[in-house]
């Protein structure tokens, strides 16, 4: 038998420095977690102790903090090289700055293979990107060989900016021939490493013949066997065992997100490359693990350039700004309310005595809110805090939509509720009631909107044929997160101001903020 240790990360989202327990900015260093310096300590400790170790990343290193805002991916290549990652799969966020923003800082600089079997380049891009990412890579591990085959969410064109010259194929369809090729080349230990979410990870384990292990990302899934060491609630045991269609037991793993944990999976293979056993758990990278001094020094050196962003206080919050995915993708969150209020405030235009304002409504995809802000840092809110919340460099735009389009959008918001997907809408100037006992597409039971043509704003039922103005992220205006109905049916679209700037201006204007959860989004069961 031959034993392989798979160390894995996913959805690190630019958390190069240690963070607080909720993955926002580190406030109390003695209680902080993660970061590449601490990760390196643990990785090196395991490499020294165990013979056959692979360090893998399942995508979405890009996007999430000021590090990416400033360094645009160069930081990812530099520190992943320093940690000596063995392979990385492309995530959807690797395309946030377009293909050029992937090629130049990361693909050309990485000293490790970057993988995706289901992304096919066409046109002039094909020759430009050729060889810079691969469908698979055969890696030497001790005296054995291991094949790693990559995959990326086929939803990426809806979630990011890959352009028109990359085709995202069905994962399973694309993976099978690559796995077959690896087997034909005598590679009998194959890991699927990718970024399509836990449900797809499980499907790959079930459907792709020859895959021995699946290491995933995208859904920030936390798996754990036994008592979990922090706040994350396990979605299942680690590893999660899937019985494949050909009767094999295939371990599937993911390691939450934000570099808080290091996935640790031990696999035992027989001489034919069959998995005999698998066990492990994510390792919580808490302060009991020291930060590596050399990596920490390097972080501090790179950090200097960021300090202009970090030091400027924009205003204060006297409440916790809950921007966690656990809240904002499931229910009204006060970070969503804050942002929407800022978006409306930024669009106050008293141009007509008949209207208190030309626009009263805001919608914001919960998945676009990427971090909370802890008030226990003297209440200070900085550019860096906001860059972690709104890392995408988008704009808040003005559109005109029919009521019927808005209704469709709110149905889409909850059509697959409960899977922590980003399309759950946060709102301003809207009161919505959902009944989740009803079938998808028929769950919005009440939708009231704030009047504009009124001296005293009040909420009235949405009219299907009326045209409304709405402030929303350009991401949604462009049909992102599956809001194709907005893109297809919008009657007018005017691009607006930079998202962080809108919120920072609002906070600076307000000086002290205390957004609440106030019943903008409600859930009910029964007749209406």
């Amino acid at each position: 038998a031959w034993e392989l240790t798979i160390l894995h990360t996913n959805d690190v989202h630019s958390r190069l420095e240690q963070t607080s327990e909720d993955s926002s900015k580190c406030v109390n260093a003695s209680r902080c977690m993660g970061g590449v310096a601490r990760l390196f300590t643990k990785v090196q400790q395991i490499r020294r102790a165990e013979p056959n170790v692979l360090l893998l990343d399942a995508g979405d290193q890009y996007q999430g903090t000021i590090w990416f805002t400033v360094y645009k991916g160069a930081e990812v290549a530099h520190f992943m090289n320093a940690l000596r990652y063995d392979a990385m799969a492309l995530g959807n966020h690797e395309f946030d700055n377009g293909v050029e923003g992937l090629i130049e800082p990361l693909l050309k600089e990485a000293k490790f293979p970057i993988l995706s079997a289901n992304i096919k380049a066409k046109g002039p891009l094909a020759s430009q990107i050729s060889g810079l990412y691969l469908p698979y890579k055969v890696l030497p591990v001790g005296d054995e060989v291991v094949g790693i085959v990559g995959y990326t969410s086929k939803e990426t064109p809806f979630l990011s900016n890959p352009g028109t010259n990359l085709v995202f194929e069905d994962e399973i369809t694309a993976l099978q021939p690559e796995v077959d090729k690896l087997k034909t080349l005598n590679v009998n230990k194959i890991i699927a490493l990718g970024h399509s979410g836990f449900e797809m990870d499980k499907l790959i384990a079930q459907k792709v013949r020859g895959v021995d292990v699946v290491v995933g990302g995208h859904s920030n899934t936390f798996l754990y066997t036994g008592n979990p060491p922090s706040k994350e609630v396990p979605a299942g045991k680690y590893p999660f065992i899937v019985t494949s269609d050909d009767g094999r037991k295939v371990p599937v793993v993911q390691a939450y997100a934000f570099g808080k944990y290091l996935g640790y999976l031990k696999i035992e293979f027989d001489e034919r490359g069959n998995v005999i056993s698998s066990h492990g758990n994510p390792i919580l990278l808490n302060s009991s693990i020291p930060e590596d001094p050399s990596i920490k020094a390097d972080i501090n050196k790179w950090r200097i350039k960021l300090d202009n962003y970090s030091t400027q206080e924009l205003g204060k919050t006297i409440v916790y700004l809950d921007g966690s995915s656990q809240s904002c993708r499931f229910r009204e969150c006060n970070m969503g309310n804050l942002i929407c209020d800022a978006m409306i405030n930024n669009n106050l235009r008293h141009t007509d005595e008949m209207f208190w304002n030309h626009v009263s409504m805001c919608i914001l995809n919960g998945g676009g809110i990427r971090s909370p802000i802890d008030e226990r840092n003297n209440g200070t809110i900085t550019w860096e805090n906001l860059a972690a919340v709104l890392p995408f460099g988008g704009t808040f735009d003005l559109v005109q939509l029919k009521g019927s389009t808005l209704k469709k959008a709110f149905e889409h918001s909850v059509h697959r509720y409960g899977q922590s997907t980003g399309e759950f809408l946060q709102v301003g100037g809207i009161h919505v009631v959902y009944d989740l006992s009803r079938k998808p597409g028929d769950r919005v039971v009440k939708l009231d909107v704030l009047c504009t043509k009124c001296r005293v704003p009040s909420y009235d039922p949405l009219k299907m044929d009326e045209v409304y103005k709405v402030i929303l992220p350009n991401f949604l205006a462009n049909g992102g997160d599956g809001f194709q109905m907005i893109k297809d049916e919008l009657l007018r679209h005017d691009s607006g101001d930079q998202d962080i700037n809108v919120v920072s201006t609002y906070i600076s204007k307000m000086k002290v903020i205390y957004p609440a959860v106030e019943g903008r989004i409600k859930f009910s069961t029964g007749s209406h």
């Epitope: 060989v145 087997k183 034909t184 005598n186």
Partner: antibody
Amino acid sequence: QVQLVQSGGGVVQPGRSLRLSCAASGFTFSSYGMHWVRQAPGKGLEWVAVISYDGSIKYYADSVKGRFTISRDNSKNSLFLQMNSLRDDDTATYYCARGHLLRIGDIFYYSLDVWGQGTLVTVSS
Amino acid sequence: QSVLTQPPSASGTPGQRVTISCSGSSSNIGSNTVSWYQHLPGTAPQLLIYTNNHRPSGVPDRFSGSKSGTSASLAISGLQSEDEADYYCAAWDDSLSGYVFGTGTKVTVL
């Protein structure tokens, strides 16, 4: 030593069938993909088929697809090529060969590193 | 019809250097390693060289290989009479899902 010994060639009429065998020794047969390659008189080498180490994956050249079947018996260290609906243009010397993934440093090279002695198949009426 | 193209013949006098080219595409040479085989009449083909100059034991170092983009080449320096044979390049082809051989080059020692 590592060797592949072939058998089963001969003269056969068009439309008939023939089965070639290849006996392996000196290496762990079940760890290697195996190929069949042929050379028609006066022509170059033509790849025919491959089978993965465990027999689960098989690929064929377009010229033989649907007529030839590659198989293996790992318990007997044997490789086979079942040739049905033979045609005149299948006349060739057939070779079995071992597919080898060689590691040199961190680079892997794939080649056919061990070959059988060849067996002549003549399709003629 | 082979998808790897080689010149049909090459020749040289003893001691000379002979180079054989092998042209393919992104689905074979472009994305996979190349091997070269020597085939003497009446014998089985023999693996001669891997891409980037790696030779199996017993193959003299006057044989060298290289690859650039979608092409490969085999060089024989210090040509000897026993080098008279047919030479084939080969690579896995991802589009065809199979191993492909070149058209073959007959090397003659004058």
